[in-house]
């Protein structure tokens, strides 16, 4: 179950540690936010810090060099190593859920494809800890709403298994 005990905000792997390209983004979010959108990258998963750093770089490279975005689209990425990787962070508008939802939400993406399996318990704990930390830091409203990517756009993301999982988290709300 999702926890909201902010006693310890687990450290987030900063951009310089996973050797991110410099961000070119400028659009700020208006905190605290009411919405969190959970997606999956639909690509390779990773289960060690080294492989997850590489995967974060891969996603960022695709978003910036192929799609021409100002940065990796997600505010945060979650690895199956149990770590949270900083994307655009709490302060900058993401490119994860379309232009209506992006300015009012934080986008967190699990690195991997979760159509047929759930993320590791470590990854799930990392995501839940991130959300609790967001509330504790004032980046998310205490009564924030959690959405699946497919709730806000026509997509299979975050995958059937991860989608079913987050629907049981207390902040999940439909429509």
């Amino acid at each position: 179950q999702e926890t909201e005990d902010p006693a310890c905000c687990s450290p987030i792997v900063p951009r310089n540690e996973w050797k991110a390209l410099a961000s070119e983004c400028a659009q700020h979010l208006s905190l605290p936010l009411r919405y969190v959108v959970v997606s999956h990258t639909a690509g390779s998963s990773c289960n060690t810090p080294a492989s997850c750093q590489q995967q974060a770089r891969n996603v960022q490279h695709y978003h910036m060099k192929t799609l021409g975005w100002c940065d990796v689209g997600y505010n945060f990425l979650i690895g199956e190593d149990g770590l949270v990787y900083e994307g655009r962070g709490w302060n900058f508008t993401g490119a994860h859920s379309g232009h209506l939802w992006n300015p009012m939400s934080i986008g967190i993406s699990f690195m991997g494809n979760y159509m047929d399996r759930v993320p590791t318990p470590q990854a799930i704990r990392a995501a839940q800890g991130l959300l609790a930390c967001g509330v504790a830091q004032g980046a998310l409203r205490s009564n924030y709403v959690l959405k699946g990517h497919r709730d806000v756009q026509r997509t299979l993301s975050p995958g059937n298994q991860l989608y079913h999982l987050i629907q049981n988290w207390p902040h999940y709300r439909s429509p």
Epitope: R34, H99, L100, M104, R141, P175
Partner: antibody, heavy 120, light 106 residues
Framework: EIQLQQSGPELVKPGASVKVSCMAS????????MYWVKQSRGKSLEWIGY????????SYNQKFKGKATLTVDKSSNTAFMHLNSLTSEDSAVYYC?????????????WGQGTTLTVSS | QIVLIQSPAIVSASPGEKVTMTCSVS?????MYWYQQKSGTSPKRWIY???KLPSGVPARFSGSGSGTSYSLTISSMEAEDAATYYC?????????FGSGTNLEIK
Amino acid sequence: EIQLQQSGPELVKPGASVKVSCMASVYSFTDYNMYWVKQSRGKSLEWIGYIDPYNGDTSYNQKFKGKATLTVDKSSNTAFMHLNSLTSEDSAVYYCIRGDYGNPFYLDYWGQGTTLTVSS
Amino acid sequence: QIVLIQSPAIVSASPGEKVTMTCSVSSSVNYMYWYQQKSGTSPKRWIYDTSKLPSGVPARFSGSGSGTSYSLTISSMEAEDAATYYCQQWTSNPPTFGSGTNLEIK
């Protein structure tokens, strides 16, 4: 029962301005976006914009920028829409609408509407 | 901006008859929303996320569609269903409404 009570009908002269109010009751006002929609006589609906009462953030339809200004008074659970430089084209029924909490783009409760008539 | 074309503009149906109205969109949208408005009253939420019914909306109503074509269907017309129905998209700014389908009872 959730209610959005709008101010009464207005008859104003061209060039004047008007402020329409929308008082919310029986829900937590700051938890829900408030939207405004225009319905001209015998016509369809046009989205004007919305305001997040929590922090006052607004978003406008480009067509209504400079025409409409959205504000809130949290102490009285009231949203306001100020319309300026009125012309006959602004004559319409204006609705305030609450956006659902889980999906802010789903308009779940509508006010009764405020009829604005602009005439000399 | 995205344009929504509703057809027919006016439709007459007898009690018990099946009614279908459509909403054609100028470019693809993710979801469609429908509102019911009776004369002299405010619109009411009717169908959301293309096919979901809020509480209070009779099960004889259904919504379907994807991309640029959406529809609202009443399986068996009743007198209380006489109203104007508007479709609306939120995929692109600004959100836009269709011009409405006026459903009359025969």
